[in-house]
């Protein structure tokens, strides 16, 4: 991980400076590196019962570096800490621990939740939604004309998605029944949601004039040409069908 690891190369007296390996400036047979070349960090590695000095380009995991005027030194972080700013402040915990305000914890405190990606304790975030947008135009089967009762909808946006332990979001759309001043569809006004879309022929069973659904007929003030019962409507449909068939046989 860290280059320039210097160790003793051959047998020498305890304080001999020649023959040091890698980044060592001075070394001994028993203790390894005693000091390092410029810009390298001095760290003590425990090997069995003794500590050996090594010189590294940066401090290893579990250590932090201090650049003194005469030596760059690696110091051990607390046992549960992988990366730290100093002895008091951990910045990344070892596996199985969660970081909270510079400390490593088994579990996050009340009111916080564990982020298993960053391994930090974070505030629980609840869902936040915007105000409702205005209601949409009253429509029925995608049309804004030719009926009296339809539905209208309104939506709101999610401003803040919740975290794992946060409150779930409330519904973001709402639909309700609505009533409009019933009007005939104008020519070319039969398209979905009031969009202009001309049709060459009415679909099978469709009349050129808007026919309100039976529910809206019950409460509407009917004009004479719409005073038809269901049987009469059925008859007309059959007649229309026959007309279209006869037209096609002529050709």
């Amino acid at each position: 991980q860290n280059a320039s690891r210097g160790r003793r190369q051959r047998r020498m007296h305890p304080n001999v400076s020649q023959g040091c390996q890698g980044g060592c400036a001075t070394c001994s047979d028993y203790n390894g590196c005693l000091s390092c070349k410029p810009r390298l960090f001095f760290a003590l590695e425990r090997i069995g019962m003794k500590q050996i000095g090594v010189c590294l380009s940066s401090c290893p995991s579990g250590y932090y570096g201090t650049r003194y005027p005469d030596i760059n030194k690696c110091t051990k972080c607390k046992a549960d800490c992988d990366t730290c700013f100093n002895k008091n402040f951990c910045t990344k915990c070892k596996s199985g621990f969660y970081l909270h305000l510079g400390k490593c914890l088994d579990n996050c405190p009340e009111g916080l939740e564990a982020n298993n990606h960053t391994m930090e304790c974070v505030s629980i975030v609840h869902c936040e939604v915007s105000e409702w947008n205005p209601w949409s135009p009253c429509t029925k089967k995608g049309k804004t004309c030719g009926f009296k009762r339809g539905t209208e909808t309104r939506v709101r946006e999610i401003i803040q998605h919740p975290s794992a332990k946060g409150n779930l979001c409330p519904p973001t759309n709402e639909t309700r029944k609505c009533t409009v001043q019933r009007k005939k569809c104008q020519k070319g006004e039969r398209g979905k949601k009031g969009r202009e879309r001309k049709r060459k022929k009415p679909n099978k069973g469709e009349s050129k004039e808007a026919i309100p659904d039976s529910k809206s007929l019950e409460s509407s003030k009917e004009i004479p040409e719409q005073r038809e019962n269901k049987q009469q409507q059925k008859k007309r449909k059959v007649q229309d069908k026959q007309k279209s068939v006869s037209v096609s046989t002529v050709h």
Partner: antibody, heavy 116, light 107 residues
Amino acid sequence: EVQLVESGGGVVQPGRSLRLSCAASGFTFSDYDMAWVRQAPGKGLEWVATIIYDGSRTYYRDSVKGRFTLSRDNSKNTLYLQMNSLRAEDTAVYYCAAHDRSFDYWGQGTMVTVSS
Amino acid sequence: DIQMTQSPSSLSASVGDRVTITCLASEDISNDLVWYQQKPGKAPKLLIYAASRLQDGVPSRFSGSGFGTDFTLTISSLQPEDFATYYCQQSYKYLPTFGQGTKLEIK
């Protein structure tokens, strides 16, 4: 609870000496480098000197080198600053602080006034 | 030595304001920056370490950012107790050096 209590401040004439002490409790004193930071009246913070956790090395700002001596007694959890040849520009509140890259713990400070 | 330059040196603001203090290092100091708050007659108190990490007990309205040479301390919504002097300090290497301070006053 971490506590650092400074003592030994006072009014002294230029050229005279003063010895500041700092008694530490509530943390493992022998694990920490210790420092003195001073603040002249109405001015900012200025690092003065640091001594390594085991007392083996000391570092000073240029303006106090050769005049101030920093020492510690880990058995007594106490830090000392011997100030000799004091000058008017040494007038400040002197804070004792645990120094581990940042200054994590601070004392309440002791005032040193150098005046004739 | 690494020079630390803070700006502004003083700042007037009102409760509820968002305030930003900047600190400029004379050389690259990675994220080795600390912020302190000092109130009159009191010792400084460590607020933020490693440029952006909040010390235990520091309100979340304080935040720090930056890397290399440019650093910022932000107070999102000033509270009456936040009126104080703020100092940055580089912890990259000895000798430790502080910015000259930013005095935050009530408008």
